[in-house]
Interface confidence: low
Amino acid sequence: FERTRSLQDPCSNCPAGTFCDNNRNQICSPCPPNSFSSAGGQRTCDICRQCKGVFRTRKECSSTSNAECDCTPGFHCLGAGCSMCEQDCKQGQELTKKGCKDCCFGTFNDQKRGICRPWTNCSLDGKSVLVNGTKERDVVCGPSPADLSPGASSVTPPAPAREPGHSPQ
């Protein structure tokens, strides 16, 4: 709806949901259906995004805000504002140009998207492998062999307690 008009620019007072119609003496006209203006002072309304095909509607278009899409089951969003939908793979797989492929030995993927990543190298941290890795899960590192000498606990001691009300630096 039109607000009080500014003497400098009549269009500056056209609110979201309207456009400043130069063909009609710069009156604030409502956005037609399937279009929107999310800010005031616009000379045109933008066409609503249509969520078609592999996209599905997450939020309907209104006169003041664009539709928002997500992806149909079996696909996930990529890019700003879900500009693309990419096929899901199973855990333990990654998407290649030829489709979903199992992770190579020594790599894993615990999600339905993304690439296979190498297992953690426990020895780099001076630790040993406590639980072996799989295609779906990373290895679990345990204490170093030296820590497992007689009398040593295999459980990592808890961090020192902090005084209440103090946050870590």
Epitope: F1, E2, G17, R24, C28, S29, P32, S62, S65
Partner: antibody, heavy 116, light 107 residues
């Protein structure tokens, strides 16, 4: 689903004030403006004005400037209409209505009766 | 302000009849006209917006047409539940103004 729930009927004396509430649910409150419409007994619909739910800026129809105030509490998704210095001719049902491409959802109405 | 003149102010028709209500704007309002239905003692409901688009859940027997200054609401086959007052409204510019209403009754 979209719902607008208004406060209950009010019986007031001339000169008093009344505050009508309109609680929204089922959508993002600040995405849509809220309009107020009056319907006197046996009469038609009369647009009172609207409030921008994002900025809180009200716009009043000429006949409703002065004694009528629109306000918001976005934390509880509620719009308010306050009428001061009530007169007998303010007796009416007051509706809030969400605005998209038109007034697409309405509250159930609040009857305000002004009588001595 | 833009005046919206509705006619007739009331009508009586039989179940199954085709009913037409007209609304004339005092100046060009493009297609920015909505139609509302208000049943006795009930809340107004949006039927049609942008002159011809049915709101969600509105039966297909209701249709709207027109642009510029002349608009029409048609009920293709009147049903008992259609007894109500119907209002047009221009929303082309502030203030958005309503027509005076058309009361529809069953013979």
């Amino acid at each position: 689903q979209v719902q607008l729930v208004q406060s209950g009927s009010e019986l007031k004396k001339p000169g008093a004030s009344v505050k009508v509430s309109c609680k929204a649910s089922g959508y993002t409150f600040t995405d849509y403006s809220m309009h107020w419409v009056r319907q006197a007994p046996g009469q038609g619909l009369e647009w009172m004005g609207w409030i921008n739910t994002e900025t809180g800026e009200p716009t009043y129809a000429d006949d409703f400037k002065g004694r009528f105030v629109f306000s918001l509490d976005t934390s509880v998704s509620t719009a308010y209409l306050q009428i001061s210095s009530l007169k007998a001719e303010d007796t009416a049902v007051y509706y809030c209505a969400r605005y998209d491409y038109a007034m697409d959802y309405w509250g159930q109405g609040t009857l305000v009766t002004v009588s001595s | 302000d833009i005046q919206m003149t509705q006619s007739p102010s009331s009508l009586s028709a039989s179940v199954g009849d085709r009913v037409t209500i007209t609304c004339k704007a005092s100046q060009d309002v493009s297609s920015a006209v909505a139609w509302y239905q208000q049943k006795p003692g009930k809340v107004p409901k949006l039927l049609i917006y942008w002159a011809s688009i049915r709101h969600t859940g509105v039966p297909s027997r209701f249709s709207g047409s027109g642009s510029g200054t002349d608009f029409t609401l048609t009920i293709s086959s009147l049903q008992p539940e259609d007894v109500a007052t119907y209002y047009c409204q221009q929303r082309y510019t502030t203030p958005p103004t309503f027509g005076g209403g058309t009361k529809v009754e069953i013979k």
